[in-house]
């Protein structure tokens, strides 16, 4: 416990003390007193420095004295021989002797008491700021006019803090400028604008002078800017240091000033204003800003377009164009938005025909589509290639984002026919050579082939079954085979309307627009074994001259026997209509002058007997384009005879070209088209 | 496929605050903007404000200023919506709706109860 | 902020009528304005964006069409799916703001 006062003997005091002996005595004094220690008795062995036995006096780490020896007081009022004053409320005092003494010594008497410690004066460090009271056990600090006292009970400063600015414009200047401003204060400003803004501040260089910058130019009073997590500053010296503008970029200011003890100046004045906060100008890739300015600030709206072949694209879901606004915090809205081009996606498959493996499908990407060539080729010739469009589309520069169409080659066998032997007088054929070749099973017919849809023959096979069914792409026609070859199911039956129906259609004479076309419910698929024939053009190219030779095939009545199995065909002449016309009619089924012959006819054969017969009507005459020597068009086909082996009538299908084209029109699915 | 799954139905004191997340699935959150709007029983709908993930950047609506904090954590691929100082009015079904051009996908909704 | 006024705040109507709403922005939005339908205890779907694009999945009886401050929502044959409450949204600028709603319902 802290005494005011107290007494401290030596061992054995006033006997001597003894040898090797060490002892110490803690003094504690209350605070605010400073300890007076005084010896009024002091006999030590002396030596030099005290070595030997001493009596020691230590404050803290420091050694106030270190005593030995004999003293007698100097004053004859006082008993005292030594004394000590320190201005702190402990002390120790250690006494040490050492293994002998020559002599005897009876060693120390001393005394303490509290005393009181001017605080005001007796350190160096003065404890206040301002003005220091001295009482008895401690002290206190005031201060002057307008300033207040710190928390620490020690410091004054000026009341400069707590200002918050909200207004658009203002000024703030430090405390009595521009006369000096107050030591050992800190000064806190606040600026607090709406969201969207940001602080500017501006200084002129003669409006501030602060305490300059120590040896190591460090701010011994300073002025410093904190906006968000960005500082400006700390700025000291005679005349601003810093930007005379300062952008903060932040709607939130703090203004700091702080200042020490000593080295008043004049202070400093700023003026600041709100600026709307601006956002970058930012390069947009492929993309165009409107309105275009130099500088965008909050509140701005743009509208971002995307250069053609680009565009934005959220999920499945893509627009040309959005908008973005400049915010609040300095950025843009849609900032994520990006324009990128334009996907055309994975082209589209075509029929009987192929799209190449495109490397990209974004804008610019360029694909081709082929047919499955030689079976088919594409309607429009330059509907190969396509290029992936700004809106999004593969276009083609002939039929823009309409697909090309692969349609069938037609009039080309893939193995000529060739005679090998001498229908009646023909020869064995291939259904390579007559890819066109249909077979009707019921009546036992034939017919052509002209596109994937359609199937020409004569109106007198369908007359009595329109539903027949047919069968394509095999040479021979027994059951076994005709069950692995291509069977065509019709879906309507259209006989020209010239064509004259008849009760007994065993007794006909009249022939006169024997045509007919099927319509089938499948696209057939071409193939080596099937294909279409052309059909005649409309110029005069294709009016059949006598002598012109054409090719006719079917599985219709031979020489041998009623019907063929295996395909036949015949190479023969065109003949004028009177050859046929004088021909006996083998069975007439009425007077040979009421059978009608019309320039809707043609008369072919003649010529060793090759002739078509009962089995072969509704196939094709063919005869080779005058226009392309590759190819076969079907001129005639089978209609009627005088007599097997002789000469026999064609349906002259140029005749037909307009009908058969509207009929195919009129009736066409939309994929056709 | 693309899932916002938010967090079950919460009932606060007024006062108190409350935290509601939105979990993402099927894309990341880093390429879009997260969105919290609430509707309040029998209202329309509200904009709260939104966050870009990518940078944890935030706008809000003038009218929650100061109250609402959306945050982000792209390794769990998902948003908070914090609301403090709750009063009675603040009773709404609060969604999160993931945009860039628009809210294409919405959460399925929280409803927060204030009440005494 | 931008306000958005919807019309009318509520409707009745017939399956296989013929619906428009309107929205009105207080100042001029551009097309940056979406609709949307809420079914009661559902999330809101997108239906419309950029004022007059289908979102994908949306049925071709559903339209957007105008630009500046005056849109329309029209649903050309209702259907009973249809009934609901639909909201106009400007996504011009911040805050983005949504319309009070117009719900439809069966006559």
């Known amino acids: 416990e802290p005494t005011m006062y107290g007494e401290i003997l030596s061992p054995n005091y006033p006997q001597a003390y003894p040898s090797e002996v060490e002892k110490s005595w803690d003094i504690e004094v209350p605070e605010g007193y400073g300890i007076h220690l005084y010896f009024t008795h002091l006999d030590i062995e002396l030596s030099e420095n005290c070595a030997y036995d001493s009596v020691q006096i230590i404050s803290g780490d420091t050694e106030e004295g270190r005593l030995c020896g004999q003293r007698s007081s100097n004053n004859p009022h006082s008993p005292i021989v030594e004394e000590f004053q320190v201005p702190y409320n402990k002390l120790q005092v250690i006494f040490k002797s050492d293994f002998s003494n020559e002599e005897r010594f009876t060693g120390f008497a001393a005394y303490y008491v509290a005393t009181d410690i001017n605080e005001c004066t007796d350190f160096v460090d003065v404890p206040c700021s301002h003005f220091c009271n001295n009482f008895i056990g401690g002290y206190f600090c005031s201060c002057p006019p307008e300033y207040f006292l710190h928390d620490d009970m020690k410091n004054c400063g000026v009341n400069c803090s707590g200002d918050v600015f909200t207004a658009l414009i203002g000024e703030i200047a430090s405390p009595n400028y521009p006369k000096p401003y107050p030591e050992n204060s800190r000064c806190e400003y606040q600026i607090r604008l709406e969201k969207g803004f940001q602080v500017v501040v501006t200084l002129r260089r003669e409006d501030f002078d602060v305490e300059a910058a120590d040896s190591a130019g460090n701010c011994l009073d300073s002025l410093v800017f904190v906006a968000g997590d960005r500082q400006f500053g700390p700025y000291c010296g005679h005349g601003f240091p810093g930007p005379l503008n300062i952008e903060t970029k932040s709607n939130a200011l703090d203004i700091i000033f702080q200042t020490d003890l000593t080295g008043q100046k004049k202070g400093w004045k700023l003026r600041y204003h709100g600026d709307p906060m601006p956002c970058p100008k930012e390069d947009t890739p492929n993309s165009v800003w409107e309105p275009a300015k130099a500088k965008y600030v909050f509140r701005d709206v743009v509208q971002i377009t995307c250069l053609d072949g680009f565009e934005v694209v959220e999920g499945r879901v893509g627009a040309t164009s959005f908008y973005s606004t400049c915010q609040s915090n300095g950025k843009w809205s849609n900032s994520k938005l990006k324009c990128q081009p334009v996907d055309c996606g994975i082209p589209e498959s075509i029929e009987n025909g192929k799209v190449e493996d495109p490397e990209s499908t974004l804008f610019g990407s360029v694909i081709r589509y082929t047919c499955e060539e030689p079976y088919y080729y594409m309607e429009n010739e330059e509907g190969g290639e396509y290029h992936c469009a700004g809106n999004g589309s593969w276009v083609n520069e002939v039929l823009g984002p309409e697909l090309p169409k692969c349609v069938p080659v037609c009039g080309v066998p893939r193995e000529p026919f060739e005679e090998k032997q001498r229908i009646i007088g023909g020869s064995d054929a291939d259904i390579k050579n007559f890819p066109w070749q249909v077979f009707f099973d019921n009546p036992w017919a034939g017919g052509a082939l002209i596109n994937e849809y359609w199937v020409l023959t004569a109106a007198h096979v369908v007359e009595g079954n329109r539903e027949p069914t047919m069968y394509v792409g095999s040479t021979s026609v027994q059951t076994s085979r005709l069950a692995k070859s291509k069977m065509l199911t019709p879906e309507h039956v259209f006989i020209h309307p010239g064509w004259k129906l008849l009760e007994v259609p065993e007794g006909r004479t009249n022939f006169d627009n024997d045509i007919a076309l099927v319509r089938l419910k499948d696209p057939v698929k071409m193939g080596p074994t099937v294909s279409p024939i052309c059909l005649p053009g409309t110029s005069s190219d294709y009016n059949l001259m006598d002598g012109d030779l054409g090719l006719i095939s079917g599985w219709g009545r031979t020489e041998k026997r009623d019907r063929a199995v295996r395909l036949k065909a015949a190479r023969l002449p065109v003949a004028p209509l009177r050859k046929c016309k004088e021909v006996k009619v083998e069975k007439p089924t009425a007077d040979a002058e009421a059978y009608v012959f019309t320039p809707n006819m043609i008369c072919a054969g003649g010529e060793k007997g090759m002739d078509s017969c009962k089995g072969d009507s509704g196939g094709a005459f063919a005869v080779q384009d005058p226009n392309d020597k590759t190819k076969f068009y079907a001129a005639g086909l089978v209609s009627w005879g005088p007599q097997c082996g002789t000469y026999g009538l064609y349906t002259r299908v140029k005749n037909y070209v307009d009908w058969i084209m509207k009929t195919m029109q009129e009736n066409s699915t939309p994929r056709e088209d | 496929q693309v899932q916002l799954v938010q967090s079950g139905a919460e009932v606060k004191k007024p006062g108190a605050s409350v935290k509601v997340s939105c979990k993402a699935s099927g894309f990341n959150i880093k390429e879009y903007y997260m969105h919290w709007v609430r509707q309040a029983p029998e209202q329309g709908l509200e904009w709260m404000g939104w966050i870009d993930p990518e940078n944890a950047d935030t706008i809000y609506a003038q009218k929650f200023q100061g109250r609402v904090t959306i945050t982000a954590d792209t390794s769990t691929n998902t948003a908070y919506m914090e609301l403090s100082s709750l009063r009675s009015e603040d009773t709404a079904v609060y969604y999160c709706?993931?945009?860039?051009?628009?809210?294409?996908?919405w959460g399925q909704g929280t409803l927060v109860t204030v009440s005494s | 902020d931008i306000q958005m006024t919807q019309s009318p705040k509520s409707l009745s109507a017939s399956v296989g009528d013929r619906v428009t709403i309107t929205c009105r922005a207080s100042q001029d939005v551009r097309t940056a304005l979406d609709w949307y339908q809420q079914k009661p205890g559902q999330s809101p779907k997108l239906l419309i964006y950029?004022?007059?694009y289908r979102y994908s999945g949306v049925p071709s009886r559903f339209s957007g069409s105008g630009s500046g401050t005056d849109f329309t929502l029209t649903i050309s044959s209702l259907q009973p799916e249809d009934f609901a409450t639909y909201y106009c949204?400007?996504?011009?600028?911040?805050?983005?703001?949504f319309g009070q709603g117009t719900k439809l319902e069966i006559k």
């Open positions: 950029s004022a007059s």
């Open positions: 709706a993931r945009s860039r051009l628009f809210f294409a996908y």
């Open positions: 949204q400007q996504q011009y600028t911040t805050p983005y703001t």
